[in-house]
């Protein structure tokens, strides 16, 4: 089926991975489709097979090299096409001239750890993963803390408008279990979006000292 609503979205992780999602209403689950990448100034071509992730969407990763290798730059253009098999031939279902540094989505931050915890505050640090050195300090972060009895969606967002890989959470309740997540976004790129949220870090504040005001 080709008359359904289609969407083709790809992001570059700033190092060696382009991740793509192709969705099409009314498409058959067993349709064989792939993403083909044709760079304008590189010697390689790359293809990945689109695999189903839901009823009407497929995803794949174009792995361009070792995870931390810088495979594309701000001047690269990669023509990306969705090709689906129709009988004996491949049909172009979507096409774009992909500018990697206009379409960034970094990997989720990793290595979250509690640096110091008290009754009312907690200092947490993290690291960014597979992020290009091109960004220098031009990154921002969002963080959120899950309190007891609340959902992640209810958690207020804390914005860090600079490359700061730590946060000091204040006004916490003593002897209480919390969870914390962080995500990162480069300042560069018209279609750039937030990374996925990090894996949650669970921590517990210290109990208040007996006989003292809290």
């Amino acid at each position: 089926a080709v008359n359904g609503t289609s969407q083709f979205t790809c992001f570059y992780n700033s190092r060696a991975n382009i991740s793509c999602v192709w969705s099409q209403d009314g498409a058959l689950q067993d349709t064989s489709c792939q993403v083909h990448a044709w760079p304008d100034r590189r010697r390689w071509n790359q293809t990945c097979e689109l695999l189903p992730v839901s009823q009407a969407s497929w995803a794949c990763n174009l792995i361009l090299g070792a995870p931390d290798s810088q495979k594309l730059t701000t001047v690269d253009i990669v023509t990306l096409r969705v090709l689906c098999r129709e009988g004996v031939r491949w049909r172009v279902m979507a096409i774009q001239d992909f500018k990697p540094f206009e379409n960034l989505r970094l990997m989720a931050p990793i290595s979250l750890q509690v640096v110091h915890v008290e009754t009312h505050r907690c200092n947490i640090s993290w690291e960014i993963s597979q992020a290009s050195h091109y960004f220098e300090r031009h990154l921002e972060f969002e963080a959120r803390t899950l309190s007891p009895g609340h959902t992640w969606e209810e958690a207020p967002l804390l914005t860090l408008k600079q490359k700061q890989e730590w946060i000091c959470l204040e006004t916490l309740t003593p002897d209480t279990q919390y969870e914390f997540q962080v995500r990162v976004k480069p300042l560069q790129g018209e279609f750039t979006t937030w990374s996925p949220w990090s894996q949650p870090l669970a921590f517990r504040t210290k109990p208040a000292a007996l006989g003292k005001d809290t």
Epitope: V2, N3, T5, S6, F8, T9, W38, D40, I77, T79, R81, R91, V92, M93, A94, I95, Q96, D97, F98, K99, E102, N103, E190, F191
Partner: nanobody, 126 residues
Framework: QVQLVESGGGLVQPGGSLGLSCAAS????????MSWVRQAPGKGLEWVSS????????HYADSVKGRFTISRDNAKNTLYLQMNSLKPEDTAVYYC???????????????????RGPGTQVTVSS
Amino acid sequence: QVQLVESGGGLVQPGGSLGLSCAASGFTFDNYAMSWVRQAPGKGLEWVSSITGAGRGTHYADSVKGRFTISRDNAKNTLYLQMNSLKPEDTAVYYCAKYSSSTYYPPTPARGTDYRGPGTQVTVSS
């Protein structure tokens, strides 16, 4: 704000040629796919041709394939349509259109545009 302004239309004899231009402003031109569509008198909009942001991919309606060429000059923020071997049935108002993203979908190329210019009249007649 996004602005698209077509030019180059006119009266031409069958078999003749004409070149249309579309000057774009108000957006990062080379980040977006573009297209040409046309509307003949008393008819609906008909998709003519599409081009990717860097001009590396192009598609054409069967009715114009081999006669029309779409191109773009990103340094000048301008989209072009070179029309050769014109026929009376090419008579229409020609519009340039901006897609809402860098992607277009060849099976349904008329879908996904968000801005269109005021158009330029092309008349093919002897």
